[in-house]
């Protein structure tokens, strides 16, 4: 299974899902553009699955608000998009196997790298 | 009303290239990713590839990587592909599309440009 | 690359009749498929989009259902319009893929 690769635009819903993976414990975002959000390379959480009740989205951070989960669990996430937010989605499970869905955002290569 | 002018049909030698083009019209190309698809006759469609014509970031299937060149021109509305290199197999209709996006399809097409490769 | 396979290469219909076309990935596909209409004139045209999503424009006698792997086309009162080459796409990962098609005829 490759996993997903995306297209979308600002203001589009993308779904993310977790296919192949037994028991999804958390997901992971790798940015094309870090610098476009502010951030450092590389992979940081965005979202875990809680003992109990909803996901647990860390509150600083890019998707506050923008993330959502589709079913009782994580295995099926839904985006609002946000221009930034291209990169490499990893869903993680308990056993430490994990599936990945590559997104592009329309524009994010030029409006990443415009000046201000 | 949104269209995709394709120009007209080549007629073009094997081992030469062919540039085809299409002009977008009713839409800005820079709000959509523009595709292209070949036909061969009597067959089905081939996704080739497709371009974020803001920044030009293109992305081909495998089978046509160095052999399709996607672009686009913003000032003029314009997407281009350009297939080198050609044999009997790339005669085919080409289409040009658009797309908001994975979950939207490919949702406009051209008119398709007919490329016959004979000497 | 994921595979699309439509097992019918053509089938023919009496008008009025309901048609199933049937499309199969050969992995989970999310939902991200979409099908196109291709006139025998070679005008293509989106029909459905995200398996169940009318396209602006396209008759409510379209409809598209499936989940997984399975997916499929119906038309529920088939007229001579009708009459096309019918082709799934998945766009669930790159390359995007297509189906072989379905040559629709009245009989």
């Known amino acids: 299974n490759p996993g997903a690769s995306l297209d979308g635009r600002p203001g589009d819903r993308v779904d993310l899902s977790c296919g192949g993976v037994s028991h999804p414990i958390r997901w992971v975002w790798a940015p094309s553009f870090p610098a476009c959000k502010g951030l450092s390379k590389g992979r940081r959480p965005i979202l875990w699955a809680a003992a109990a009740g909803a996901p647990t989205v860390p509150p600083l951070q890019p998707f506050v608000g923008r993330l959502r989960s589709l079913d009782s669990g994580i295995r099926r996430l839904e985006l609002l998009l946000s221009a930034g937010d291209s990169g490499t989605f990893f869903c993680k499970g308990r056993h430490e196997d994990e599936s990945r869905t590559v997104l592009h955002v329309l524009g994010d290569r030029t409006y990443c790298k415009a000046p201000g | 009303e949104v269209q995709l002018q394709q120009s007209g049909a080549e007629l073009v030698k094997p081992g030469a290239s062919v540039k085809l083009s299409c002009t977008a019209s009713g839409f800005n190309i820079k709000e959509t990713y523009i595709h292209w698809v070949k036909q061969r006759p009597e067959q089905g469609l081939e996704w080739i590839g497709r371009?974020?014509?803001?920044?030009?970031?293109?992305r081909y299937d495998p089978k046509f990587q160095g052999k399709a060149t996607i672009t686009a021109d913003t000032s003029s509305n314009s997407a281009y592909l350009q297939v080198s290199s050609l044999t009997s197999e790339d005669t085919a209709v080409y289409y040009c599309?658009?797309?908001?996006?994975?979950?939207?399809?490919?949702?406009?097409w051209g008119q398709g440009t007919s490329v016959t490769v004979s000497s | 690359d994921i595979q699309m396979t439509q097992t019918t290469s053509s089938l023919s219909a009496s008008l009025g009749d309901r048609v199933t076309i049937s499309c199969r990935a050969s992995q989970d596909i999310s939902n991200y498929l979409n099908w196109y209409q291709q006139k025998p004139d070679g005008t293509v045209k989106l029909l459905i989009y995200?398996?169940?999503t009318l396209h602006s424009g396209v008759p409510s006698r379209f409809s598209g259902s499936g989940s997984g792997t399975d997916y499929s086309l119906t038309i529920s009162n088939l007229e001579q319009e009708d009459v096309a080459t019918y082709f799934c796409q998945q766009g669930y990962t790159l390359p995007w893929t297509f189906g072989g098609g379905t040559k629709l005829e009245i009989k």
């Open positions: 599309a658009r797309s908001y996006g994975s979950s939207y399809g490919i949702d406009y």
């Open positions: 371009i974020d014509p803001a920044d030009v970031y293109g």
């Open positions: 995200y398996t169940s």
